[in-house]
């Protein structure tokens, strides 16, 4: 969480950003809020990126002004027009690329004053893992698969029965580069599993953490997956 203030004494407003993570190949959100103004026409929103000459996006007088927009952001950015009046200056970014990572500045002008805050935008790939019984294996095994990760994550297995156990000796993890030569498919196999136990496959990089659980009993198999972005830490 980053809170910025204007630099002109009493003519300053609070602008707040969140460290954000973008999943490459999807639309992303760069989060920014500010003290609202009652008149939309008095609000100016400028998004800038460190190392980029042109603007990322500009909104003023109640509408987009893309005349000074940098080429790399053409056709890709939008603010939530109907939410600007209530202090939402967040930016939507179409088709996030690895190169979109960096430091952005959300700069706001209203009738109350000016303010800005920086935002660290991380880009990578993350996806839900799916854990299944691996019927190809000679012994009872579990196979954990996740189609897209970047940077290369760590994979850790855990079990409800053997809490604290280290499964690195009885598991094998591989990373297969996907066709666009950036993201990778993650496959991890856990050997010698026992029934009446719940196993968890945890995949994590500096952007996201995902977990795939499987409960194996004599009568049924239950699965559950979750994904958590590691994007709200204080800068």
């Amino acid at each position: 969480l980053i809170i910025g203030f204007g630099i002109s004494g009493r003519h300053s407003i609070t602008v707040t950003t969140l460290t954000s993570a973008g999943n490459i190949g999807e639309d992303g959100i760069l989060s920014c809020t500010f003290e609202p103004d009652i008149r939309l026409s008095d609000i100016v929103i400028q998004w800038l990126k460190e190392g980029v000459v042109g603007l990322v996006h500009e909104f003023k007088e109640g509408k987009d002004d893309l005349s000074d927009q940098d080429e790399m952001f053409r056709g890709r950015t939008a603010v939530f027009t109907d939410q600007v009046i209530v202090g939402n200056a967040s930016l939507r970014l179409k088709n996030v690329q690895l190169t979109d990572a960096g430091t952005y500045k959300c700069y706001i002008i209203t009738s109350k004053g000016k303010g800005n805050a920086n935002l660290e935008y991380k880009t990578g790939a993350f996806s839900m893992p799916e854990v299944n019984l691996d019927y190809n294996a000679s012994s009872e095994s579990l196979r954990c698969e996740a189609p897209r990760w970047f940077p290369q994550p760590t994979v850790v297995w855990a079990s409800q029965v053997d809490q604290g156990a280290n499964f690195s000796e009885v598991s094998n993890t591989s990373f297969e580069l996907n066709s666009e030569n950036v993201t990778m498919k993650v496959v991890s196999v856990l050997y010698n599993v026992t029934v009446n136990n719940t196993y968890s496959c945890m995949i994590e990089n500096d952007i996201a953490k995902a977990t795939g659980d499987i409960k194996v009993t004599d009568s049924e198999i239950k699965r559950r997956s979750s994904l958590q972005l590691l994007n709200s830490r204080a800068a």
Epitope: D27, D64, Q69, A125, S179
Partner: antibody, heavy 115, light 109 residues
Framework: EVQLVESGGGLIQPGGSLRLSCAAS????????MNWVRQAPGKGLEWVSV???????YYADSVKGRVTISRDNSKNTLYLQMNSLRAEDTAVYYC?????????WGQGTTVTVSS | EIVLTQSPGTLSLSPGERATLSCRAS???????LAWYQQKPGQAPRLLIY???SRATGIPDRFSGSGSGTDFTLTISRLEPEDFAVYYC??????????FGQGTKLEIK
Amino acid sequence: EVQLVESGGGLIQPGGSLRLSCAASGFTVSSNYMNWVRQAPGKGLEWVSVIYGSGRTYYADSVKGRVTISRDNSKNTLYLQMNSLRAEDTAVYYCARDTYAMDVWGQGTTVTVSS
Amino acid sequence: EIVLTQSPGTLSLSPGERATLSCRASQSVSSSYLAWYQQKPGQAPRLLIYGASSRATGIPDRFSGSGSGTDFTLTISRLEPEDFAVYYCQQYGSSPMYTFGQGTKLEIK
């Protein structure tokens, strides 16, 4: 050269199924937003479906539950599986790449649904 | 759902004249996500303008786009014989994910 080539269209009976293909060259399908857009005879353009680089998919209400967009990254090819076809699905189907907008289009493949 | 309404439905002009085509959205559309396409009979559409005002690669400078919010315009400053076609505006980013206008037919007077 950046190019898209559709195939798989034809005459099909109502209720039938068809799979359209779109072979890409000069760029990677899995790095882009890839769309299917259709045009009924004498009518305007209608968006059908998109698959994001991440694999996330979206569909127009008119086809939801009846069509599936997918891709084969190894073949650099986009697909549209169409089931429970109706007369109103008769159209030229185009695949299109969306970067900043739909900048690359195929030549289209014609689907005719008729008994 | 965002509806794009194009006007006029048909525009009859002569070569050398100026053409002004309108696209009105039922609610605000980001300028970045507004595009214009040209389609000739028997051909696939061709991207002309993206980001409301940026010309696509290879598009002559007689084509220009403008507007923001709910009102967008495609202008062809001096019509050439090859410009007579159907023109579509299109938006991205709302449900449905993409929407096209119904088209404006530009015909020779």
